[in-house]
């Protein structure tokens, strides 16, 4: 019951997190005009990953897309890439985790398969969350760097007289949404990984039994394939639970109940 709850909660938390990552990626307010130097501005600027916007004194907001790809800063491209990778991984993770949910029965899917899928989705959520956090953090770092550079340049110029106050940008709402969403996705992923441990049936402790056949003694030892991926068992004729690594040419056909701890 606790396992199902952990898995379900992990799924819900990840779902909220990924929705947040998508929202953050689409939001226009990644950076907003810093009003400290000009609190009375009638023209408010803010920028997103895809377009920049200006809200004018009439209340009208004009947004213009970045219609160039090559002209954009490499850092912005990197942030876009990280966010998209995060969304894609998160979406795939959600798809996998739906089938992995213990409360949903799909044919005769065994617990080991569900455990395996839960682990896979958990890892995907963790990577997705990390991508989002990394993307937002890179953008935030870029903002901080630019902020202090523009502050340094603000009062320099011909004879110290500057007519144009350089617009500085500070953290927008999307950054906070992204950080929280990334964190939630990460937490959800960890919860899925924890649930995976409980989903796999307890390891059966077989007693060593010796079979005497043709003068050969083959011992069936307890515990097996602790490090395996669980998508199949050894179909060759050497049925020895040796707990070791398998060779690459071994065919994997059906999941083993004892592939997970």
């Amino acid at each position: 019951m606790a396992v199902t709850a952990c898995q379900g909660l992990g799924f819900v938390v990840s779902l909220i997190g990924i929705a947040g990552i998508i929202a953050a990626t689409c939001m226009d307010q990644w950076s907003t005009q810093d009003l400290y130097n000009n609190p009375v501005t009638a023209v408010f600027n803010y920028q997103g990953l895809w377009r920049s916007c200006v809200r004018e004194s009439s209340g009208f907001t004009e947004c213009r897309g970045y219609f160039t790809l090559l002209g954009l800063p490499a850092m912005l491209q990197a942030v876009r890439a990280l966010m998209i990778v995060g969304i894609v991984l998160g979406a795939i993770g959600l798809l996998v985790s739906i089938f992995a949910l213990k409360c949903i029965r799909i044919g005769s899917m065994e617990d080991s398969a569900k455990a395996n899928m839960t682990l896979t989705s958990g890892i995907m959520f963790i990577v997705s969350g990390l991508c989002a956090i990394a993307g937002v953090s890179v953008f935030a770092n870029m903002l901080v760097t630019n902020f202090w550079m523009s502050t340094a340049n603000m009062y320099t110029g011909m004879g110290g007289m500057v007519q144009t106050v350089q617009t500085r940008y500070t953290f927008g709402a999307a950054l906070f949404v992204g950080w929280v969403a990334g964190g939630l996705t990460l937490i959800g992923g960890v919860m899925m990984c924890i649930a995976c441990r409980g989903l796999a049936p307890e390891e059966t402790n077989y007693k060593a039994v010796s079979y005497h056949a043709s003068g050969h003694s083959v011992a069936y030892k307890p515990g097996g394939f602790k490090a395996s991926t669980g998508f199949g068992s050894n179909t060759k004729n050497k049925k020895i639970y040796d707990g070791g690594a398998r060779t690459e040419d071994e065919v994997q056909s059906y999941p083993s109940k004892h592939d997970y701890v």
Epitope: A42, E56, G59
Partner: antibody
């Protein structure tokens, strides 16, 4: 078509208050701020402040704080400006204006303060 | 507050001649976000409400005759009427649309010589 229709002229005694209305039509009322401008007889234009009909947020020119109060009624797409403690120098034509770059102005409301 | 200074106060021009009005702001009206100058020009005829002529310092409002043109950037702006017509007799105002409080120039009265 877009229209901003203001209430009629008012004559008030010093110390009294007056409420001028501005009814908007022909556009989505909550999409644009409604600003108010004062024009004293034979004088130039002076910005009073604005109201955001979407969330009731207001901003005033420091000179008019305590003098003008802006409110709105979204059900009737109407903005109101109340001028309190009227004095002779408040005698002016008051305009409401809206849309991008204030493309549309009301016809103006003459408020006369006279004893 | 941004101070808008218009000159001259009044201007008498012959029909068909060019009229030029100057407007200076005490601070730059250039918005770095979109590289637009937030300066607006209005025309006010006697007994009427002001009418929008030009926004962003040089963009003509739809329906405004092309004899009206705006130019300038930063702090110095100009409104030009290339060939004055009788219906252009009015007071012209420039307005800071960049910073609160929004401020207007004192106005320039254009008359026919």
């Amino acid at each position: 078509q877009v229209q901003l229709v203001q209430s009629g002229a008012e004559v008030k005694k010093p110390g009294a208050s007056v409420k001028v209305s501005c009814k908007a039509s022909g556009y989505t009322f909550t999409n644009y701020f409604v600003h108010w401008v004062k024009q004293a007889p034979g004088q130039g234009l002076e910005w009073i402040g604005y109201i955001n009909p979407y969330n009731d947020d207001t901003k005033y020119n420091e000179k008019f704080k305590g003098k003008a109060t802006l409110t709105r009624d979204t059900s009737t797409s109407t903005v109101y400006m109340e001028l309190s403690s009227l004095r002779s120098e408040d005698t002016a034509v008051y305009y409401c204006l809206s849309l991008r770059f204030f493309a549309y102005w009301g016809q103006g409301t003459l408020v006369t303060v006279s004893s | 507050d941004i101070v808008m200074t218009q000159s001259p106060d009044s201007l008498a021009v012959s029909l068909g001649e060019r009229a030029t009005i100057s407007c200076k702001s005490s601070q730059s009206l250039l918005n770095s976000g979109n590289q637009k100058n937030y300066l607006t020009w209005y025309q006010q005829k006697p007994g009427q409400a002001p009418k929008l002529l030009i926004y962003w310092a040089s963009t003509r409002e739809s329906g405004v005759p092309d004899r009206f043109s705006g130019s300038g950037s930063g702090t110095d702006f100009t409104l030009t009427i290339s060939s004055l017509q009788a219906e252009d007799v009015a007071v012209y105002y420039c307005q800071n649309d960049y910073s609160y409080p929004l401020t207007f120039g004192g106005g320039t009265k254009v008359e026919i010589k």
